[in-house]
């Protein structure tokens, strides 16, 4: 499948809007300081340039690889010195070393300023008055805040947002109508950017291996009438698309995903009966609808898996022959039966039967040895139920925001050293979990939760990894990913902290927290648990929950008063030292 | 303020039963998790059953089908029937309770009681 001219191709395959899309969010994606007039030149001059190979493959450096092309123009960028430091060290590099340079300089939470939203007629008008540039800087903002964002899947939510402003800026309540969809799409933005990032991670800390079979595991769920060989064709190709999103190849990514989309809802009898919908949308509704499609029905009476896997004589014969193959046998045999399974429990399970083979088939009497191996599933069954039954009961009787206090308390006593804006974002996100999956019957909760958990965890993992703080934080981040959770779960109270000093400003608050939003309000209170509890790591949940109490009704009242910023100042100071007496600070 | 008070423990042969029971007092435990960890000499404090506010129960693998956890909102107690006592549950037992009760580590209970033992003759 050679081509004279590699941008050619892809400009070919992906059509003008979709090349130029794709190449500012690689851009951005690489360069997460520079302006969006900058990015739209050089986006400009690489497409003008792609047009001349497509009117003449053989014209002058329409041979280069794509990272040639693409790192040779952001190498031209006259300010990158001063702008990215170090990073300007890998324009001195050779393909592929100079990408995979630019690549190790992403930056997971770069110094930019928090999006803030302009009035919606302000925005309906800069939409109306230039509706391409408006679109582009959509993606420019994501892609530099997100910079493993899912490139085809951005075009995706750029394609709603567009039709949110062509509704909306011509509804009677421009606000009532555009306001809740730009909400729900920066929350699903949200989360699809940190599922994503966990796919990278999984592929570029952890291998190819990592990925597939995580992905023969869910894939497995989702498609249980779909024969092994065809969920082995669907991962294959499932993780050279991500691979190459991952790896910055974002024009090759987007292309290959609309042929594995292609590929699926031609074969959709041999795949999954519920692909029907989604296979009747347009090319990217089409890619996010398969995406997130609902399991199939598991097949009528499966029969047992010891029979293949434990009773079989040609157990450790089969393992020895493909061991690979074997195992992701195991495990698309074991997630068709059990969509109620979080895909990291089935590869624990996995990996603990791999463990197992290993051994047994080494010793005596395989068979006699590897009897038992299902016994030893039940524990690890067990374990993430137990965890998933106390949390949500727990959230059942808190509500998510002290459900969210009560994992900020947790998760600081365990990893103090961890930022407090980290430590905030991670455990309200972690708290999350229960208004996303408490809700859905025991059948659906393990997958919903867990798999959810091992995103968000994924997030402090590489947030933690820019600067890293903690050994123990490092230890759950890179000795498994499957395990991380459990990891985790499983660190005590780290004894070794020495507290914060007390500093009598980080609880100083003023008037302003009054124009807030709930939120953000929320945000700040939290901000001032994680401080008190890095301050008196042995105070106890009561004690913390007393002064937070306290310290809510002080807002409360402050935000009352006719003269907001005294009263801020003055019982801010009789606050203090109320807490420090009952804390013993 | 807050007492966590066991009793119940003492000598008992290897496959006979003991009923511990651990009194609450200082405040309401209504919506608390209450349980049990043990500590045999040497070792670390390790779980053995929590139930919670729901009375939903927990239990460690090693005393799964062998002990029940109770309790009793009216009395502030809970209670932990140990069945088949094998020599390895020797140990001193302590009863904890917490307002969040989630976890099943030392550190996740911030009550305390001071600990009864139990001594498991072969």
């Known amino acids: 499948d050679a081509h004279k001219s590699e941008v050619a191709h892809r400009f070919k395959d992906l059509g003008e809007e979709n090349f130029k899309a794709l190449v500012l969010i690689a851009f951005a994606q690489y360069l997460q300081q520079c302006p969006f007039e900058d990015h739209v030149k050089l986006v400009n001059e690489v497409t003008e340039f792609a047009k001349t190979c497509v009117a003449d493959e053989s014209a002058e450096n329409c041979d280069k690889s794509l990272h040639t092309l693409f790192g040779d123009k952001l190498c031209t960028v006259a300010t990158l010195r001063e702008t990215y430091g170090e990073m300007a060290d890998c324009c001195a590099k050779q393909e592929p070393e100079r990408n995979e340079c630019f690549l190790q300089h992403k930056d997971d939470n770069p110094n930019l300023p928090r999006l803030v939203r302009p009035e919606v007629d302000v925005m309906c008008t800069a939409f109306h008055d230039n509706e391409e540039t408006f679109l582009k800087k959509y993606l420019y903002e994501i892609a530099r805040r997100h910079p493993y964002f899912y490139a085809p899947e951005l075009l995706f939510f750029a394609k709603r947002y567009k039709a949110a402003f062509t509704e909306c800026c011509q509804a009677a309540d421009k606000a009532a109508c555009l306001l809740p969809k730009l909400d729900e799409l920066r929350d699903e933005g949200k989360a699809s950017s940190a599922k994503q990032r966990l796919k990278c991670a999984s592929l570029q800390k952890f291998g190819e291996r990592a990925f597939k079979a995580w992905a023969v595991a869910r894939l497995s769920q989702r498609f249980p009438k779909a024969e092994f060989a065809e969920v082995s064709k669907l991962v294959t190709d499932l993780t050279k698309v991500h691979t190459e999103c991952c790896h910055g190849d974002l024009l090759e990514c987007a292309d290959d995903r609309a042929d594995l989309a292609k590929y699926i809802c031609e074969n959709q009898d041999s795949i999954s009966s519920k692909l029907k919908e989604c296979c009747e949308k347009p090319l990217l509704e089409k890619s996010h609808c398969i995406a997130e499609v609902e399991n199939d029905e598991m097949p009528a009476d499966l029969p047992s898996l010891a029979a293949d896997f434990v009773e079989s004589k040609d157990v450790c014969k089969n393992y020895a022959e493909a061991k690979d193959v074997f195992l992701g046998m195991f495990l698309y045999e074991y997630a068709r039966r059990h969509p109620d399974y979080s895909v990291v429990l089935l590869l624990r399970l996995a990996k603990t039967y791999e463990t197992t083979l290993e051994k047994c088939c080494a010793a005596a009497d395989p068979h006699e040895c590897y009897a038992k191996v299902f016994d030893e599933f039940k524990p690890l069954v067990e374990e993430p139920q137990n965890l998933i039954k106390q949390n949500c009961e727990l959230f059942e009787q808190l509500g998510e925001y002290k459900f969210q206090n009560a994992l900020l308390v947790r998760y600081t006593k365990k990893v103090p050293q961890v930022s407090t804006p980290t430590l905030v974002e991670v455990s309200r996100n972690l708290g999350k979990v229960g208004s996303k999956c408490c809700k859905h019957p025991e059948a659906k909760r393990m997958p919903c939760a867990e798999d959810y958990l091992s995103v968000v965890l994924n997030q402090l993992c590489v947030l933690h990894e820019k600067t890293p703080v903690s050994d123990r934080v490092t230890k759950c981040c890179t000795e498994s990913l499957v395990n991380r959770r459990p990891c985790f779960s499983a660190l005590e109270v780290d004894e070794t902290y020495v507290p914060k000093e007390f500093n009598a400003e980080t609880f100083t608050f003023h008037a302003d927290i009054c124009t807030l939003s709930e939120k953000e309000r929320q945000i700040k209170k939290q901000t001032a648990l994680v401080e008190l509890v890095k301050h008196k790591p042995k105070a106890t949940k009561e004690q913390l929950k007393a002064v937070m109490d306290d310290f809510a009704a002080f807002v409360e009242k402050c935000c009352k008063a006719d003269d907001k910023e005294t009263c801020f100042a003055e019982e801010g100071k009789k606050l203090v030292a109320a807490s420090q007496a009952a804390l013993g600070l | 303020q807050v007492q966590l008070v066991e009793s119940g423990g003492g000598l008992v042969q290897a496959g006979g039963s003991l009923r511990l029971s651990c009194a609450a007092s200082?405040?309401?435990?209504?919506?608390?998790?209450m349980g049990w960890f043990r500590q045999a000499p040497g070792k670390e404090r390790v779980f053995v059953a929590t139930i919670s506010w729901k009375s939903s129960t927990y239990y460690a693998d090693s005393v799964k089908g062998r002990f029940t956890i109770s309790r009793d909102h009216a009395k502030n107690t809970v209670y932990l029937q140990m069945n088949n006592l094998k020599p390895e549950d020797t140990a001193v037992y302590y009863c904890?309770?917490?307002?969040?009760?989630?976890?099943?580590?030392?550190?996740?209970?911030?009550?305390w009681g001071q600990g009864t033992q139990v001594t498991v003759s072969s």
């Open positions: 200082g405040r309401t435990f209504s919506n608390d998790a």
């Open positions: 904890v309770a917490d307002p969040y009760g989630l976890g099943f580590n030392p550190s996740d209970y911030d009550y």
